[in-house]
């Protein structure tokens, strides 16, 4: 049997119902409607999509974002929702489909010709003109790899981890998301026990680097559950 094992930075997702795949009702999927593994008869058809549970946008597909399915719904229940097309309402960039970004609550095209000025204006609007930096982090930097070709450096505004340079991930910082360093061995990490707990973090940590996982520090085993310290440790 095959088991999904999410890394320490993600919630432990329940797999979709047997014989089906996860996704969205009514979503048009351009790829062939099935999964085919060469060398065998493991073919199954995907017709009815089921919502996929998530804690953050990075756990969803590139044409999705992570949110509560109902307006003002339970923050602990989040699923991957189909991205919003141009001229649809939005609250953040990740809600808009690739090639678009969120400006003044509406998804607009990230057309290269007039994009740079608009995005800088949007970032300034979001954070106010008074403070151009937050804890020394510059605000007017790469927003998305779909928009700029250079990868975001540490402190750059981002949508997802693929927007950031190697060794960095995209994590929440106040009400924005910026590129932060992936955690090294021995650094404190966050182990999420509850679904949706990502949404409560104002200062989100990156996940542990390659070959590391977030585990309880050995000398903290005796401590109470709430005070247990997790660190990045070798597998």
């Amino acid at each position: 049997t095959l088991n999904s094992v999410l890394n320490s930075n993600a919630i432990k997702n329940l797999p979709p119902p047997l014989g089906g795949a996860a996704g969205h009702p009514g979503s048009a999927v351009s790829a062939a409607p099935g999964i085919l593994y060469p060398g065998g008869n493991k073919y199954q058809t995907i017709d009815n999509y089921q919502p996929y549970p998530c804690a953050e946008d990075e756990e969803c597909g590139t044409d999705e974002y992570c949110a509560s399915p109902t307006r003002g719904g339970d923050a602990g229940v989040q699923i991957c929702l189909a991205c919003r097309k141009r001229r649809k309402r939005c609250m953040r960039h990740a809600m808009c489909c690739p090639g678009n970004y969120c400006k003044n609550g509406i998804c607009v095209s990230s057309d290269q010709n007039h994009f740079r000025g608009e995005i800088e204006e949007t970032i300034t609007e979001s954070f106010g003109n008074d403070h151009s930096t937050l804890d020394g982090y510059s605000r007017r930097t790469t927003l998305s790899s779909k928009m700029y070709h250079t990868k975001g450096q540490e402190g750059s505004v981002c949508l997802r981890s693929s927007d950031c340079a190697s060794g960095l991930c995209c994590a929440r910082h106040f009400w924005s998301k910026i590129c932060k360093p992936v955690l090294k061995e021995g650094q404190v990490c966050t182990k999420h026990r509850r679904k949706g707990s990502h949404g409560l973090e104002i200062f989100q940590r990156c996940y542990c680097g390659e070959g590391l996982s977030c585990r309880i520090q050995k000398d903290h085993h005796q401590a109470s559950n709430s005070s247990r310290l997790h660190t990045c440790q070798r597998h």
Partner: nanobody
Framework: EVQLVESGGGLVQAGGSLRLSCTAS????????VGWFRQAPGKERDFVTA????????AYADSVKGRFTISRDNAKNTAYLQMNSLKPEDTAVYFC??????????????????WGQGTQVTVSS
Amino acid sequence: EVQLVESGGGLVQAGGSLRLSCTASGSAFSSHVVGWFRQAPGKERDFVTAINWSGARTAYADSVKGRFTISRDNAKNTAYLQMNSLKPEDTAVYFCAAGRDRYARDLTEYEYLWWGQGTQVTVSS
């Protein structure tokens, strides 16, 4: 179109380690799911592990859980398979594969559209 090239295979003793790389060229690698599969002589090609476009989700076959680790570096257009505590039964040709990651689903259920040529891993006892 995505072209995939595997490297890092070879002969290793039981208990040893190997690190396979899967380097992509062509279409935007950072928006694809990447999977590793293996095929032993006379057997079916089996799922080993997979990672979603961002690296936030991974999945492993039970037989490799705790020994193998998948990761990716989108800036380098490369995915990695770190294989530790290798056993003779891990001997196989290892293939990497990629597919569009537009809609999230269980990582064992993706349609892998592009495949590499494979790299031989032999574990001797």
